[in-house]
Amino acid sequence: CDLPQTHSLGNRRALILLAQMGRISHFSCLKDRHDFGFPEEEFDGHQFQKTQAISVLHEMIQQTFNLFSTEDSSAAWEQSLLEKFSTELYQQLNDLEACVIQEVGVEETPLMNVDSILAVRKYFQRITLYLTEKKYSPCAWEVVRAEIMRSLSFSTNLQKRLRRKD
């Protein structure tokens, strides 16, 4: 399955929007910094077949979409930017979903892919717990925004590598 060219443009737009969403200086939130243990090894693109990589990317975007679709998120960000960001993620989800279905049809997830999906889920669990512990403070959201920018950059790079493999 070839992801449409608009997909990579959507990735870039999502990153730009997320950058624009920053409301407070990252430096004023240094005390709140946290290592969420992003599962880099799941995004290096070496141990995967393309199909499996797309499933993991889908999980990544889906969890990001869910994180920014909460009431707490709505209260934290400028509404029009948040809506545009969510729209970009939703479009990416549609592209990836179509690819997962096209590549293998609806079937059981390959065993080697199961732990990668769980690793992504656990990463977002750590982010969710951090926000809860910090009572969704502005600095906590700023730390999370910066973290998601980093993880989306990894996703974008993996997708570039997948396109080069084609």
Partner: antibody, heavy 119, light 108 residues
Framework: QVQLVQSGAEVKKPGASVKVSCKAS????????MHWVRQAPGQGLEWMGE????????IYAQKFQGRVTMTRDTSTSTVYMELSSLRSEDTAVYYC????????????WGQGTLVTVSS | EIVLTQSPATLSLSPGERATLSCSAG???????LYWYQQKPGQAPRLLIY???NLASGIPARFSGSGSGTDFTLTISSLEPEDFAVYYC?????????FGQGTKLEIK
């Protein structure tokens, strides 16, 4: 509010198959994995597997591999769990439970569907 | 597979007393992925505590959770009549996800 409504009780003969449905409402159906958990009479809870309603990919517990099939219909926001080659030990209440994160993990359950396997 | 063993199987106490329920894991479970559920007869399980020690929405403060590694505890500080039920610990730290066999909390 989030609601998961399951199909009614079933009685099946050994060797037959059963298909239980779980209709979701009150949230975006394709955003969350749906899990199936069963409970034999007087026994504990047992995780069977999960399905991503967005693209339909599944993850099954090894114990049920080859006998369980989870599917979904996005047009009706419904997930299905089919169990084949039924035996008496499969007599249980089958629950669907919605995934999520933090306080949302298995925070929402269907009411349960009793499947009785008897000759 | 991570086996969760709950003890005791049955706990007989009176309202007002303190209840301590244990959950022992066969191998280490990250505390972020250890949950507790309450189940009453004829009902679906209900989320009580998530990530070892966090109270789910609407759960009274008399419930608390603690632990790490392989040993986890659910404590009910002062039992109310509605607390008598079966309690399950659950992990989703690794596949397959598992539940303990349950502790039945009954009125003495």
């Amino acid at each position: 509010q989030v609601q998961l409504v399951q199909s009614g009780a079933e009685v099946k003969k050994p060797g037959a198959s059963v298909k239980v449905s779980c209709k979701a409402s009150g949230y975006t159906f394709t955003n969350y994995w749906m899990h199936w958990v069963r409970q034999a009479p007087g026994q504990g809870l047992e995780w069977m597997g999960e399905i991503n309603p967005s693209h339909g990919r599944t993850i099954y517990a090894q114990k049920f591999q080859g006998r369980v099939t989870m599917t979904r219909d996005t047009s009706t926001s419904t997930v299905y769990m089919e169990l084949s080659s039924l035996r008496s030990e499969d007599t249980a209440v089958y629950y669907c439970a919605r995934g999520g994160l933090g306080p949302a993990w298995f925070a929402y359950w269907g009411q349960g569907t009793l499947v009785t396997v008897s000759s | 597979e991570i086996v969760l063993t709950q003890s005791p199987a049955t706990l007989s106490l009176s309202p007002g007393e303190r209840a301590t329920l244990s959950c022992s894991a066969g191998s280490s479970v990250d505390s972020s992925y250890l949950y507790w559920y309450q189940q009453k007869p004829g009902q679906a399980p209900r989320l009580l505590i998530y990530s070892t020690s966090n109270l789910a929405s609407g759960i009274p403060a008399r419930f608390s959770g603690s632990g790490s590694g392989t040993d986890f505890t659910l404590t009910i500080s002062s039992l109310e009549p509605e607390d008598f039920a079966v309690y399950y610990c659950h992990q989703w730290s690794s596949y397959p996800f598992t539940f303990g066999q349950g502790t039945k909390l009954e009125i003495k």
